[in-house]
């Protein structure tokens, strides 16, 4: 992967009102199941079509839940995070960090006709062009000198 | 209303083959991690395989090799395709989803599922 990839880290409030089949979305993570290395934290990975979380629209694939009605979720087993949200009750407040990538450099591969991802044969080869053309001009101005 | 039904049971004998399935009804299957388990008589209910919303799989050692769990997301159905059945297979077979959990382990290794079917038998003599 060529170039760095940071984050820019928000967090917010999301109060969900219980479906017929929970809160709309899957969790992974735990101290027994860590999604993210170093990192025991309770991800979301599933927003189910048409759950709560789905109509409400602001949770995202890829969120870390910190808390569940005030409840910390650091240092939990998968099971027992699990069972916090299988008890939380009919509404629901969670408190989420959302991660949106920014891109520093060229990362991996982009489509053809991104105008952010630009070759970079096509910015260094100008340039070395440029460079040629003023150093010769350069020489060419100290012979006449 | 979610609703989960189990077929395909019944009597085989030992080195035969059986598949069940189970058809899901109320919700779509492939948002949910769910898994096969069984209960023989006198015995606690253990997980048997299990399969995440993202497709990853788990299976319990004693069906290691034997078993296969899959999904149909057209047909919404999940399914245990069982070979080289031994007669210690004999159990009540349930499907169960939870609602939260994502990790195929996990709900292999837990009882606190949110969603159960009612079973079929599964005989190994």
């Known amino acids: 992967m060529n170039g760095r990839v940071d984050y820019l880290v928000t967090e917010e409030e999301i109060n969900l009102t219980r479906g017929p089949s929970g809160l709309g979305f899957n969790i992974v993570g735990g101290t027994d199941q860590q999604y993210v290395s170093n990192d025991s934290g309770i991800y979301v990975s599933r927003i189910k079509e048409n759950g709560a979380a789905a109509l409400d629209g602001r949770l995202q694939e890829g969120d870390k839940i910190l808390s569940v009605n005030g409840q910390d979720l650091k240092n939990l087993l998968h099971q027992d995070a699990v069972d916090l949200f299988r008890n939380a009750g009919y509404a629901v407040s969670l408190r989420v960090q959302h991660r949106l990538q920014v891109q520093n450099g060229p990362i991996g591969h982009r489509g053809e006709g991104d105008p952010s991802g630009i070759p970079i044969f096509m910015v260094l080869v100008p340039v070395f062009a440029l460079t040629m053309v003023a150093a010769w001009a350069f020489m060419r101005y100290r012979q006449q000198l | 209303q979610v609703q989960l039904v189990e077929s395909g049971g019944g009597l085989v004998q030992p080195g035969g083959s059986l598949r069940l399935s189970c058809a899901a009804s109320g919700f779509t299957l492939d948002d949910y991690a769910i898994g096969w388990f069984r209960q023989a008589p006198g015995k606690e209910r253990e997980g048997v395989s299990c399969i995440s919303s993202h497709g990853s799989t788990y299976y319990a050692d004693s069906v290691k090799g034997r078993f296969t769990i899959s999904r149909d997301n057209v047909k919404n159905t999940l399914y245990l395709q069982m070979n080289s059945l031994k007669p210690e297979d004999t159990a009540l077979y349930y499907c169960?989803?939870?609602?939260?959990?994502?990790?195929?382990?996990?709900?292999?290794?837990?009882?606190?599922?949110?969603?159960w079917g009612q079973g079929t038998q599964v005989t190994v003599s």
């Open positions: 169960a989803a939870s609602y939260y959990s994502d990790y195929e382990v996990a709900v292999c290794r837990s009882d606190a599922l949110d969603a």
